[in-house]
């Protein structure tokens, strides 16, 4: 997260880290005791999932292996449309005050809605600085029409934009797959942005979760 702040401890109990060995690979969101939602571009053969801590590499955090993941069938490596994936944990999460599932959206929030995005991604760009603490940024949803003025054809129909005018605050490498939460519901998953990160008036781009609720529910049901 560029130009963000340290999240209030315990305020994001649904936030998970997808680790490759001990290293951060992507963010993710707990949606059920067996399931984590993340970005399709975060796909690996297997994952170590850290839950219940704001500190990356926290020894006291829950760590659960995951060997199965289900990319959206329409994901494109060229256009990055349908950048959404479900990761099935090998064993169920122990729910607590530190580990909770996020609320999936009942509706799509409108432009102008205030939201918070979080992650352990680099806080500087192009030189990288990975924080140990979970970082947050407060952003507002931007209309598709406004965002298309910036990104033109790069912006797909199920992509959601968020940012703050003239501000550098944005997501960056390592934040991918992490949550954009608006009014206590998951509205976005970190997908992409301009590199180097933090170019003013280049919004962060997210997978618009409200457009995928049926796919999420059906995929979890199929692979119970």
């Amino acid at each position: 997260i560029i130009d963000g702040y340290k999240c209030k401890e315990g305020s994001h109990p649904w936030q998970v880290a997808l680790l490759k060995g001990n290293q951060l690979h992507c963010g993710g969101v707990l949606v059920d005791k067996y399931w984590v939602l993340t970005a399709a571009h975060c796909k690996m053969g297997q994952y170590q999932v850290q839950l219940g801590s704001d500190k990356i590499g926290d020894q006291s955090a829950q760590k659960i292996k995951a060997t199965k993941s289900f990319r959206h069938p329409g994901y494109s490596t060229k256009t990055h449309v349908n950048d959404i994936m479900l990761v099935r944990l090998d064993e169920p999460v122990k729910m607590s005050s530190k580990v909770e599932a996020v609320q999936l959206p009942e509706h799509c929030e409108p432009p102008g809605t205030s939201c918070t995005v979080s992650g352990w991604g680099t806080t500087t760009s192009p030189d990288v600085t990975f924080p140990s603490d979970l970082m947050c940024s407060d952003v507002k949803l931007i209309s598709s029409r406004e965002c298309k003025k910036v990104y033109k054809d790069l912006l797909g129909k199920t992509m959601l934009c968020a940012g703050i005018p003239d501000s550098k605050t944005n997501t960056c490498n390592g934040d991918s797959g992490g949550p954009l939460v608006c009014n206590d519901t998951l509205q976005g998953l970190v997908s992409w942005g301009t590199y180097p990160c933090g170019q003013p008036n280049d919004p962060g781009v997210y997978t618009q979760v409200c457009k995928y609720k049926r796919w999420v529910m059906e995929t979890m049901k199929t692979h119970r």
Partner: antibody, heavy 122, light 107 residues
């Protein structure tokens, strides 16, 4: 179809400033998600990235050339420019302008100009 | 800067041969690795992006693989029009850097 075209003098005297302009057609230089780059190739040699500029005006330069390079953009003309000061014979090269799709999850040069040979000689 | 070591620097093969070029990065670059083809007097042309994705319009005989530090570029069946110099390029960190190139000739 995006097209890029370099223009500028083909001969520059040592110690002077090399100035090149790249005109972009078929796409807007103000589009987000792209950077506008200069890359050079010494005769018979490999490729060297010089630097890039964004629609915001942010610039990034190769540290090996940083003290001598300035890249600027003119969005009204859909052009960006390179200035390389205090040139020597070692700056003789084919200079390319190129667009890069430059996102957090993918980065590559997708469109290139045809290149222009700049010779540094008195 | 990240150094990109490409090998071989040149090779000669027959039409129909399988040709393999390797590229090694001096540090982990994930899959931020691209391959370009350059014909004499022309600008480089993108063939493969993100280590393994074929650019639109590029023949399927070209392919790429690898992740981290070691990458491979393959022409499954060399054609006369493939005579060119091929470059790898890392896009993980600025400054972006290129390999030294591999000149491919026909026997």
């Amino acid at each position: 179809q995006v097209q890029l075209q370099e223009s500028g003098p083909g001969l520059v005297k040592p110690s002077q400033t090399l100035s090149l302009t790249c005109t972009v057609s078929g796409g807007s230089i103000s589009s987000g998600g792209y950077s506008w780059n200069w890359i050079r190739q010494h005769p018979g040699k490999g490729l060297e990235w010089i630097g890039s500029i964004y629609r915001s005006g942010s610039t990034y330069y190769n540290p090996s050339l940083k003290s001598r390079v300035t890249i600027s953009v003119d969005t009204s003309k859909n052009q960006f420019s390179l200035k390389l000061s205090s040139v020597t014979a070692a700056d003789t090269a084919v200079y390319y302008c190129a667009r890069a799709k430059q996102l957090t999850l993918t980065r590559y040069f997708d469109y290139w100009g045809q290149g222009t040979l700049v010779t540094v000689s008195s | 800067d990240i150094q990109m070591t490409q090998s071989p620097s040149s090779l000669s093969a027959s039409v129909g041969d399988r040709v393999t070029i390797t590229c090694q990065a001096s540090q982990d670059i994930a899959n931020y690795l691209n391959w370009y083809q350059q014909k004499p007097g022309k600008a480089p042309k993108l063939l493969i992006y993100d280590a393994s994705n074929l650019e639109t319009g590029v023949p399927s005989r070209f392919s790429g693989s690898g992740s981290g530090t070691d990458f491979t570029f393959t022409i499954s069946s060399l054609q006369p029009e493939d005579i060119a110099t091929y470059y790898c390029q890392q896009a993980s960190q600025l400054p972006f850097t290129f390999g030294g190139g591999t000149k491919v000739e026909i026997k």
